[in-house]
């Protein structure tokens, strides 16, 4: 069954799944944060074999790879801002 | 057991140009998550960060190398190279392939391969 | 850049003492997602780095006991419960925050 639509209410999941999916079937994971008219974050995994599934993104396993992504988008250290001084 | 290993020139002249490879096994740059980074160490100093690549093609450098630094991987070979541009004499050191698992960076190491830069 | 200070820069301990080795970095190294990748690495001569400790505090696989890491922000320490023989050698801590990723200068752990 397709999991991801688009529906009136803008979300792109109907269901969503906290099978684990082993990471050499994953091929890419999207991170849609709430918004946009969906009240709720999404993660859409794109597999391998070419089937998208929605994950819980409560499921522990989602998390981690996640983590993988936040850590390598969060690499370049952040400028300082530095406020002038008024006399 | 994953294993990596390092192959080079051994021995290059000032300007010419270094390439690395990197071959390893038990592991897939074809998995979310996994990358291949490369680390030199001169004789008897410590180490540093030179480049590493991801499972999707994304690249880091060396902003102090960046111009002189190409990574790149072939990932049915289960290969990763660098190339260094322009060697000198500061280059001469043992150079090292690493994996990176998700978070761990550079969990697992090769035995290293030494360049000495000499004319 | 952020720059990896250890101290000392040598350690001479007794085998079966305690040993602790520290590290400072020029800026806070926790991301924003909240995430702090410190990592301790161990040298011994000849040989290429092994990995002992990821994310300031977390045993890798085959790890003993004895090597615990802790610190958060820009302070973190690895300590060494019970030196045995085969724990001489460097040891580099390491930040995977933000790229450039840098090494501290090394702490050699050395029998006195």
């Known amino acids: 069954v397709l999991e991801v639509y688009y529906t009136s209410l803008r979300c792109r999941c109907v269901q969503e799944s906290s099978v684990f999916i082993p990471r050499r079937f994953i091929d890419r994971i999207q991170i849609l944060p709430r918004g946009n008219g969906c009240p709720r974050k999404e993660i859409i995994v794109w597999k391998k074999n070419k089937s998208i599934v929605c994950v819980d993104p409560q499921a522990e396993w989602i998390q981690r790879m996640m983590e993988v992504l936040r850590k390598r988008s969060s690499s370049t250290l952040p400028v300082p801002v530095f406020k002038r001084k008024i006399p | 057991q994953v294993t990596l290993k390092e192959s080079g020139p051994g021995i290059l002249q000032p300007s010419q140009t270094l390439s690395l490879t990197c071959s390893f096994s038990?592991?897939?740059?074809?998995?979310?998550?996994?990358?291949v980074g490369w680390i030199r160490q001169p004789s008897g100093k410590g180490l540093e960060w030179l480049a590493h690549i991801w499972w999707d093609d994304e690249k880091y450098y060396n902003p102090a190398l960046k111009s002189r630094l190409t990574i790149s991987k072939d990932t049915s070979k289960n290969q990763v190279f660098l190339k260094i541009a322009n060697v000198d004499t500061a280059d001469t050191a043992t150079y090292f392939c690493a994996r990176i698992d998700g978070y761990y960076d550079f969990d697992y190491w090769g035995q290293g391969t030494t360049l000495t830069v000499s004319s | 850049d952020v720059l990896m200070t250890q101290t000392p820069l040598s350690l001479p301990v007794s085998l079966g003492t305690q040993a602790s080795i520290f590290c400072r970095s020029s800026h806070s190294i926790v991301q924003d997602n909240g995430n702090t990748y410190l990592q301790w690495y161990l040298q011994k001569p000849g040989q290429s780095p092994k990995l002992l400790i990821y994310?300031?505090?977390n045993r890798f696989s085959g790890v003993p006991d004895r090597f615990s890491g802790s610190g958060s922000g820009t302070d973190f320490t690895l300590k060494i419960s019970r030196v045995e023989a085969e724990d001489l050698g460097v040891y580099y801590c390491f930040q995977g925050s933000y790229v450039p990723y840098t090494f501290g200068g090394g702490t050699k752990l050395e029998i006195k």
């Open positions: 994310k300031v505090s």
């Open positions: 038990e592991f897939s740059l074809s998995v979310f998550g996994m990358g």
